[in-house]
């Protein structure tokens, strides 16, 4: 058993049929010694008496809020949550496996630049009685500070018969140098509590590996005289690290016809302009990627050819 | 993905082309190592990230762009010096790149070159003959060092009398290639910045 926060405790249980569970000692936070009784949750049924109680916790019915009273007055509370371990593996019932980039990916994180700010998100089908708390650090043995905000519900989607909820959190490394070469990964830890079930999820990464620039901005077309060619120009996104000559991007320019089946013409360039042939009803799209470290491409910025 | 090949203009900052070749070569070599040594811990997640130049050179700090010198987090161990030399600078004047930066890059290359050559000598003794260092990568390191044109004492190649542990050598190769790739990215950024200055 360990304390998650004040008066909230997590009991780690090996979960199998007829498991003996864990014996947990609860002590009433009071100077009183006599006449103390204990109840569980909203029930008025007294389960035990005395300042200290030893309870056997082996299933969710044994978890919950234990309250000690004296003469009708509440003295203190202890909330017990369960963390299940089945066949040596901690349960992952609360979050959905996003399966990207690999199986057992529950948390996904992205950074728009090298400033040390990043966003993580996760998915669940659970809509109520759900709380999350996020901690992060650079390295684990001698951790350096990363500050995370509160996790918020960022999207709701309907997937078949199910509703899916996306939660996200923003974190910022306390003293980040954009030019630094990372040798210790960022660790992100999410505590998830659904009713009386506790689970924790972790992710470990280098900022350089989760970089995904915003799409190029101010995408414009300039027709070239007496030609089917156009000059496409764009700018670095505002969110990208500066100076741009140090944090350089490379770009992919794509000409795509109306039909998905039509052949796509693609050009790669380090410049912020390119000359392409604009076909009727086609659109021109540009995306960006770090020029020197191949992490993710940005989403496309697009303009119609007409 | 192969990085786009840049054909340098005659007046272009001379080291940019070499640094791009360097990054391409080390990225290819790392990819080859990860494929060949698929049953060894050779991915970024599996290896310990060690920097053989730590406490010996200060490339990141010495080559910091001017715009980042206002960022206190970047100035932990910054040594500032604005005296420039080395042929890469040609006749361009810049207060961003100091001799310390280029000589630091040169020292990095020299240290990695020695490590890679020592390692290759061991790998050549491996009866499995599983992996060797790409001669192109070693040549590109050499070319960039020549372009930097710094004079420093030659470091003797480390020789070891004991029988090499080929498993450990291959893991060390992965660690070295990951670290060198990260350093090659920094070098490329620096050269790109210098070229624009």
């Amino acid at each position: 058993i360990w304390e998650l926060k004040k008066d909230v405790y997590v009991v780690e249980l090996d979960w199998y049929p007829d498991a003996p569970g864990e014996m947990v000692v609860l002590t009433c936070d009071t100077p009183e010694e006599d006449g103390i009784t204990w109840t569980l949750d909203q029930s008025s049924e007294v389960l035990g008496s005395g300042k200290t109680l030893t309870i056997q916790v082996k299933e969710f019915g044994d978890a919950g809020q234990y309250t000690c009273h004296k003469g009708g007055e509440v003295l203190s509370h202890s909330l017990l949550l369960l963390h299940k371990k089945e066949d040596g593996i901690w349960s992952t019932d609360i979050l959905k496996d996003q399966k990207e980039p690999k199986n057992k990916t529950f948390l996904r994180c992205e950074a728009k630049n090298y400033s040390g700010r990043f966003t993580c998100w996760w998915l669940t089908t659970i809509s109520t009685d759900l709380t999350f708390s996020v901690k992060s650090s650079r390295g684990s043995s001698d951790p350096q500070g990363v500050t995370c905000g509160a996790a918020t519900l960022s999207a709701e989607r309907v997937r078949g018969d199910n509703k899916e909820y996306e939660y996200s959190v923003e974190c910022q490394e306390d003293s980040a140098c954009p030019a630094a070469e990372e040798s210790l990964p960022i660790e992100v830890m999410v505590d998830a509590v659904h009713k009386l079930k506790y689970e924790n999820y972790t992710s470990s990464f280098f900022i350089r590996d989760i970089i995904k620039p915003d799409p190029p901005k101010n995408l414009q077309l300039k027709p070239l005289k007496n030609s089917r060619q156009v000059e496409v120009s764009w700018e670095y996104p505002d969110t990208w690290s500066t100076p741009h000559s140090y944090f350089s991007l490379t770009f992919c320019v794509q000409v795509q016809g109306k039909s998905k089946r039509e052949k796509k013409d693609r050009v790669f360039t380090d410049k912020t302009s390119a000359t392409v042939i604009c076909r009727k009803n086609a659109s021109i799209s540009v995306r960006a990627q770090d020029r020197y470290y191949s992490s993710s491409w940005s989403e496309w910025a697009s303009v119609p050819c007409s | 993905r192969n990085l786009p090949v840049a054909t340098p203009d005659p007046g272009m900052f001379p080291c940019l082309h070499h640094s791009q070749n360097l990054l391409r070569a080390v990225s290819n070599m790392l990819q080859k190592a990860r494929q060949t040594l698929e049953f060894y811990p050779c991915t970024s997640e599996e290896i310990d990230h060690e920097d053989i130049t730590k406490d010996k050179t200060s490339t990141v700090e010495a080559c910091l762009p001017l715009e980042l010198t206002k960022n206190e987090s970047c100035l932990n161990s910054r040594e500032t010096s604005f005296i420039t030399n080395g042929s890469c600078l040609a006749s361009r004047k810049t207060s961003f790149m100091m001799a310390l930066c280029l000589s630091s890059i040169y020292e990095d290359l020299k240290m990695y070159q020695v490590e890679f050559k020592t390692m290759n000598a061991k790998l050549l003794m491996d009866p499995k003959r599983q992996i060797f260092l790409d001669q192109n990568m070693l040549a590109v390191i050499d070319e960039l060092m020549q372009a930097l044109n710094f004079n420093s004492e030659t470091v003797p190649q480390k020789s070891s009398l004991e029988e090499p542990d080929f498993y450990k050598t291959k893991i060390k190769l992965c660690i070295l290639l990951h670290a060198f790739r990260i350093r090659a990215v920094t070098i490329d950024r620096v050269m790109s910045y210098l070229n624009a200055s």
């Epitope: 569970g21 049924e45 389960l47 008496s49 309870i55 056997q56 082996k58 299933e59 019915g61 044994d62 | -």
Partner: nanobody, 114 residues
């Protein structure tokens, strides 16, 4: 009508063991929280242990010590195993449906003496 009948008491030497039983009827035993209480001569009721329908147990203090509560829902029976008996364990032992003993049996006498 609720009936609780305790048995298994008797005269035991110090250091000995006993297993008390309580046969329950007249209510749904398998879904009830059950208690063992005792009353020593000239003393008030003392709570010894609690067992939930699932078999999860609750004891006073920081450990179950010498007492072990158990149940067999199929037989509608509650048990109390007492080990290493001491003279101060001499008392009337009750099974009950509440900690205050408002619904309890007639009790079974345990005497510990050499």
């Amino acid at each position: 009508e609720v009936q609780l009948v305790e048995s298994g008491g008797g005269l035991v030497q110090p250091g000995g063991s006993l297993r008390l039983s309580c046969a329950a009827s007249g209510f749904t035993f398998s879904s009830s929280v059950m208690f063992w209480l005792r009353q020593a001569p000239g003393k008030g009721l003392e709570w010894l242990s609690t067992i939930k329908p699932t078999g999860s147990t609750i004891y006073p203090g920081s450990g179950k010590g010498r007492f072990t509560i158990s149940r067999d829902n199929a037989k509608n029976t509650l048990y109390l195993q007492i080990n290493n008996l001491k003279p101060e364990d001499t008392a009337l032992y009750y099974c009950a449906r509440d900690i205050g003993g408002t619904v309890r049996g007639q009790g079974t006498q345990v005497t510990v003496s050499s």
